[in-house]
Interface confidence: medium
Amino acid sequence: EVEKTACPSGKKAREIDESLIFYKKWELEACVDAALLATQMDRVNAIPFTYEQLDVLKHKLDELYPQGYPESVIQHLGYLFLKMSPEDIRKWNVTSLETLKALLEVNKGHEMSPQVATLIDRFVKGRGQLDKDTLDTLTAFYPGYLCSLSPEELSSVPPSSIWAVRPQDLDTCDPRQLDVLYPKARLAFQNMNGSEYFVKIQSFLGGAPTEDLKALSQQNVSMDLATFMKLRTDAVLPLTVAEVQKLLGPHVEGLKAEERHRPVRDWILRQRQDDLDTLGLGLQGGIPNGYLVLDLSMQEALS
């Protein structure tokens, strides 16, 4: 243990205020009581301490709370949070969403730091599931959060949380993630009427099965091409030309520009050329007239 220097006469801090910015590091160490600091943490953020001075304050808190800071202190860490290591944060038990928000605010506008990543990990694990309020908060600060979870992790997202999801939150989700999220969204929005339902479910349709796409085609939804291109290929292939035409409505003309890309390309190969011609778009590559179509997958299932 390093021998501590005594606090000079008259310099003992009675409260955390701006006068402390003129203290040298050793004076802060000697003259600021750790318990006083802990009870007045909310003041630290308003005082322009140097990084070196913040290091001293952190050291004092570390000595006072070697097992990890209490939440009452954590909530008011402010910029001192940036001085914490992932190992420090691992000792914390953060249960309040307000505390999480306060700390995320400190890092706002910056990419996710190791500290923030660890904080979120601890918080969500402590809660046991991604409830709506937590998801709301996390996606507000980090829109990519939802798509950074594995399908298994997403399975613990309750359907009620889906209401917090915005279309941009799903931008980078891949099909396996949407496979998990789509049934939850379908459940969450089941009581909405046709047009409102489509607006809400649209972002999740990359996980929709064929039968749901067939049902949507009967509801005049006018799906845009961007959404159509994100649908599962295996879900699109069984759709008839008439169903795709109804599904896309006026957007059906966009198929021509996408005819070389999946899932449009693969879908065209499964349609009769006669049927494709009825669209009047000049789509080529369908099954020539007079050819017999064998569904080998059905044959295998029967044998």
Partner: nanobody, 124 residues
Framework: EVQLLESGGGLVQPGGSLRLSCAAS????????KAWFRQAPGKEREFVAS????????AYADSVKGRFTISRDNSKNTLYLQMNSLRAEDTAVYYC?????????????????WGQGTLVTVSS
Amino acid sequence: EVQLLESGGGLVQPGGSLRLSCAASGHTDSYYPKAWFRQAPGKEREFVASIGWGGRMTAYADSVKGRFTISRDNSKNTLYLQMNSLRAEDTAVYYCAAGIGWAPTADSGEYDYWGQGTLVTVSS
């Protein structure tokens, strides 16, 4: 049980580049590779970078920010670390780590499986 196999290490000159790979096999539905740590001779193991399952959310140690890029290919269950502008102080054994996790985390205690490591030496 998850097996992690790192590759791509080697000797490189200062300013050079390397790309590390970490292939995962076994029970990768639950535990997936999502972080790189490193340990220099005589030093403790330290966090380098971590990535969420979807690939968009990442976290980097300050010392490598802007020089290293972490990425993953879910279809191949493989994690990558592209290292550019390498410095002598980047010399270390680089370990891949797998965990369940909720997005990126720098906390080594959250990782359940570790690779054997691949040595990166930066020297002229």
